[in-house]
Every structure is written in C-alpha cells, then in structure tokens.
C-alpha cells in the first residue's frame, strides 16, 4: 500500500479513576495507554487482511480520570459498582464521532472472568464497530457504538501486560468485524493433535488466553476473512492517512519535543500545550531541560533527575530502574537471573520477564490438569507439569510424581490464571470458573437494547 492510503484508525482513550488509582500517576497511565496501543498497532500492521495491509492506530486524544474525579458529577465512570454492560453503555452514551474507536480502560473485577466488551462491526446494515456515528436508538438515547472497554483485573489479580494487550486486540477485533473464533481450523488450541494444540488459540478465541503461545497474538483466517470485509466497506468513512504526530494526545511522538495534552489537561510548566500556536505547541519552553511527559526522569521543575534517583520499582524479574542524569527516559532495568521464581512461585524469570512456568525450572513444561483428561476437578487450579510433549505425564506439582522437585507442595495458579485447557479462569477459591463467552450478550437481551442490536456486542 502507498502512504496515501487511509489506513490509520484514530483512538480516543479514556481511563477511569480506578485505573489511575492502580497505576498511581498520569505518566504511568499514559505509559500503559501507549504500550497497549503499540501492542495492537504491531499486531494489526503485521496482518494482511486479504490485501489490506499496514492497518495502524494512533491516539488522537486521551482523558485520564484521576482519583480527584471520583466524585465529579460530569465523570460518567465515577460509579464504583457497575457491571460490564453498563460500563460499556456509559462509554457509548458519549459522542465519539471524531474518532474511529473510543475505549475506556479500567481496573474493575467484572463478573465471570470478563476482561473486555465491545460492539461488533459488520460490513453493512449494522450498528457498531469502527467509524460508527452517534445516533438515536430505540431506548430513546443517542449512542456511539464505535466503542469498547477493557479491564486489567480478573478474579482479584492483575493480568499480565501481554494478556491485557491481547484483550485490547481482541476487543478491537470485534469492532473491526470479527466474531469469536469457532471451528477446528480457527481454534487449534482445542485440538487433540499435539502439534496443533501447542501453538495455542488465536486472538479471537472466546475464552481464556495465557498470551505466550505462538498463535495468541495472531488473527485466525476466520477473523481475517471477517475483518477484511468490514475494512473494505468502512475504512474510508473515518480512517486517515498515517504520518503526522498528534500534538495533544499526551504521548511524545516523532517530531514532538514533549506533549502535555491540551490546555485543560496540561499541568506541566515545561511544555507548550496543544492549544498553542503551530510553532510552539508540543515544544519545550525556553530554558527547560525536559518535560515530565517525556519520561519519569524529569522533575516538575523541568530538569533531569539526578543519577541515583529511582524511576522504576524492583519487580519479580528485574532490578529497580535508576535515572542516568542525562535523559528523561527511565533506563532499562537489569534482569534478575533466569529461572528466579516469580508470580508467587508459579512462574520463572526469562530475560527479565516473568514468562516461563515454574515447571521449566526442572526441565518440564506446564500442562493443564484438565477434566477431559480424567483429572480431579480440584486439580484444575494447580500448577501442573509434564515431560516435554508427553501429556500422559501431566500431573499436579503436589503429586508424588514431581515430589523430587516440589517436595509434595502443591503450587496453585494465581487467581485469574487460565485453567481447564483455557476454558476458564481460576477464582480466589481455586475453583476453575468457566468463561461464558456470551454471558453479557445474553444479559443485554433482557436489557434496553432493541432486537436488531443483539448480534452486535461481544466480549
């Protein structure tokens, strides 16, 4: 494709006060938004949608609701206890005509292992998905259905970034017109064939994902077929040519010195906001060394933090990050040794990431103590290990078979971890709760939407 093609979907990303509460600062929230958008940008750019290539994403605007907005009556996301359908509806009740898609990120524990919800696009005659404009629906309310939501919490635990990135790609996949994967070709993770199964399921799998299998961040042929049809019909309605950075989105992009947002958001003494004239906006103010929008190693007084200052906490697998005194960015942290236990002894560190299973420490690989294998249901939320490529040896870490490594100690999966061959997630009581992939959809049928919309919402 040539650069003149309309291939960029512009996003409006809002975060609620709970998301802010978890990440702690505006900068940390912006870093999360940035990493999520980069992740889906990589996935979509590298996918050939039946000849439509280089689909990319750009944040056009962000709104960060801080803990100070928890009581603000103009903040629609202030309510503490709302279900996932209502949360999506609150997003949809805003007018998002200026955007390809509008998302809200939260840190809420929705029922039944739901990590996200989005309206599904269709090539014609549908309401929902990319480029959809605000209109009046049968419940008497105007709604924008170019929307979705994601949460970073599941059964009381926070999901790993790679899972959250795939959740975002999955929900956006719905907006782009893909339903959940079905059929043997598009759900290889359910296959009895070991060679197919080991690569896992694709992005649009209906239930759980671990995010670390080969197919987990790829679209299936089923998804590609569906998305291609929607892109063909809809992308000219609101996609833009890629290229220019967007001053005001809070992210420092190529061609910008800094970006503290628009005048109503900019709390930065160092950077000209996006409402300033063309030559000044998103540039450092005279005499200022840096802006906190560039990274955590810049002070509010616009100077680089000193060499010894911490900019990133120590984690299970990496040492703390320390500013180097000459850049606003936080330098990469030194990794802890490979095979250091992490995630409460359920995993091990690989190259600074908590990525491998504890089984790998002993030359084994993780497996699912799945009930289809005749295992006791009580073992579904145990960490189970097997010899490489030999499912007949799959046994709990608490079993006698692996007692030489685990001394008979049962290691349980963290709440929110996939279980029973990715059919569900473990809850806080170590029960494997199956994901009802269409639960919110079923509930919505009883709610305020008219029948023609029923098909167009999905997790």
């Amino acid at each position: 494709t040539t650069s003149a093609e309309k291939n960029t979907c512009q996003l409006y990303i809002q975060t609620d006060h709970l998301f802010f509460k978890y990440y702690g600062t505006r900068e940390a929230v912006i870093a999360q938004i940035s990493s999520h958008v980069k992740a889906i940008d990589t996935i979509y750019q590298t996918t050939d949608f039946s000849g439509i290539r280089n689909i990319s994403f750009m944040v056009k605007r962000i709104r960060i609701n801080t803990t100070a907005d928890e009581k603000d009556p103009t903040n629609p996301f202030r309510f503490p206890n709302i279900g996932v359908e209502k949360f999506l509806e609150l997003n949809s009740e805003q007018n998002h005509d200026d955007y390809c898609l509008a998302y809200v990120f939260t840190d809420r524990d929705f029922d039944d292992g739901v990590l996200g919800l989005a309206w599904v696009g269709a090539p014609s005659g549908s309401s929902g998905g990319i480029c959809e404009k605000s209109k009046l629906y049968s419940d008497g309310k105007k709604k924008s259905l170019n929307t979705g939501i994601i949460t970073v919490q599941n059964y009381g635990s926070h999901v790993p970034p790679k899972v959250s990135h795939i959740t975002f790609a999955h929900e956006v996949g719905h907006n782009f017109g893909s339903p959940h994967d079905s059929g043997t070709e598009c759900t290889p993770g359910e296959s009895k064939n070991l060679g197919q199964k080991e690569n896992g399921n694709y992005i649009m799998y209906a239930r759980a994902t671990s995010g670390d299998k080969l197919n987990n961040n790829k679209f299936s042929l089923c998804s590609i077929r569906n998305i291609s049809q929607v892109l063909e019909k809809k992308r000219n309605n609101c996609f833009v040519e890629s290229g220019q950075p967007i001053c005001g989105n809070g992210m420092v992009e190529q061609g910008e010195e800094c970006d503290c947002g628009y005048s109503d958001q900019c709390k930065d003494e160092c950077c000209f906001d996006a409402n300033q004239p063309e030559g000044r906006k998103c540039k450092l103010k005279p005499g200022k060394q840096c802006s906190p929008s560039q990274g955590p190693c810049c002070t509010a007084q616009c100077a680089f933090k000193s060499k010894s200052e911490k900019c990133r906490d120590d984690s299970d697998c990496a040492r703390e990050g320390i500013c180097n005194g000459f850049t606003a960015l936080c330098p990469a942290s030194d990794p802890k040794p490979n095979f250091t236990d992490c995630n409460r002894h359920t995993q091990v560190c690989i190259n600074g990431q908590c990525a491998g299973s504890i089984c790998e420490k002993y030359g084994l690989e993780e497996c699912t103590c799945a009930s289809s294998d005749g295992k006791d249901d009580k073992e579904l939320c145990h960490v189970c290990c097997m010899k490489k490529m030999d499912p007949s040896t799959c046994a709990s870490t608490g079993s006698v078979q692996w007692s030489r490594h685990f001394s008979g100690r049962t290691i349980t999966l963290q709440p929110g971890s996939p279980c029973n061959d990715f059919r569900g997630y473990c809850d806080v009581f170590m029960r494997c709760r199956l994901v009802d992939a269409d639960g919110p959809l079923a509930r919505l049928k009883k709610a305020i939407f008219s029948p023609e919309l029923y098909e167009n919402i999905a997790e």
């Epitope: 084994l364 010899k387 030999d390 046994a395 078979q401 692996w402």
Partner: nanobody
C-alpha cells in the same frame, strides 16, 4: 547408552523372600529416580516401589508396604528390592525403570526400562 539390568528373580514358596537387583549404567546415577514395577499375565503393569537416589526418599504401593524394602548402593549404581512374606499374588515379571525427572509409581513417567526378571510364588 542407558542400561538397566534386573536379576535375582526365581521360584519361591509363599512366605519366602527374594532380593532383586537393578544394575544401572550409562547415566549419572545420583540424578535419577529408580522404580520397581511388575506385570502379571493378562494384567497391566503396576508400580511396586521407587527411590530417589539423591535423597534416598522412598515410596511404596499399599499392597507391598511392610513387606518390601527398596534401597540403593550408590557406589555400585545398583538398586535393590528386598521382598519378604511373599504371596502367590506377587507372581509377575518385575521390571526396574529409571527417570531423571519423575518419581512415583506411574509407569508413564519413566523413560528407561530393563528387560525384567520373573518372580514366581507358589502356594
């Protein structure tokens, strides 16, 4: 090449004793677990006892607890199964098996196997 050779089988009267030996070669003995299994005609192979060489921890099937004892001689790379108070139902081909990772009495978990030695207990 990993090799396991069983010996010590034979014909014995009910109530008698036998000591089976399993001589191992071709691997680092201390890194492995060694298990004894048996298979009677027309029946599935079942676990009898096992030992983790590194820490000498042992495990027994309920049917042989108190009658059989497993032990190892690390200098000789050999594992023994002392069988006392033998019963006719102990009649089977006895196999030893070795594995670097696993332990216990499930034959699926063991990678290396000997040829077996016949034990017959007459009444």
């Amino acid at each position: 090449k990993v090799q396991l050779v069983e010996s010590g089988g034979g014909l014995v009267q009910a109530g008698g004793s036998l000591r089976l030996s399993c001589a191992a070669s071709g691997f680092t003995f201390g890194d492995y677990a060694i298990g004894w299994f048996r298979q009677a005609p027309g029946k599935e192979r079942e676990g009898v006892s096992c030992i983790s060489i590194s820490d000498s921890s042992t495990y027994y099937a309920d049917s042989v607890k108190g009658r059989f004892t497993i032990s190892s001689d690390n200098a000789k790379n050999t594992v023994y199964l002392q069988m006392n108070s033998l019963k006719p139902e102990d009649t089977a081909v006895y196999y030893c098996a070795a594995d670097r990772l696993a332990y216990g009495l499930d034959p699926n978990f063991y990678d290396y196997w000997g040829q077996g030695t016949q034990v017959t207990v007459s009444s």
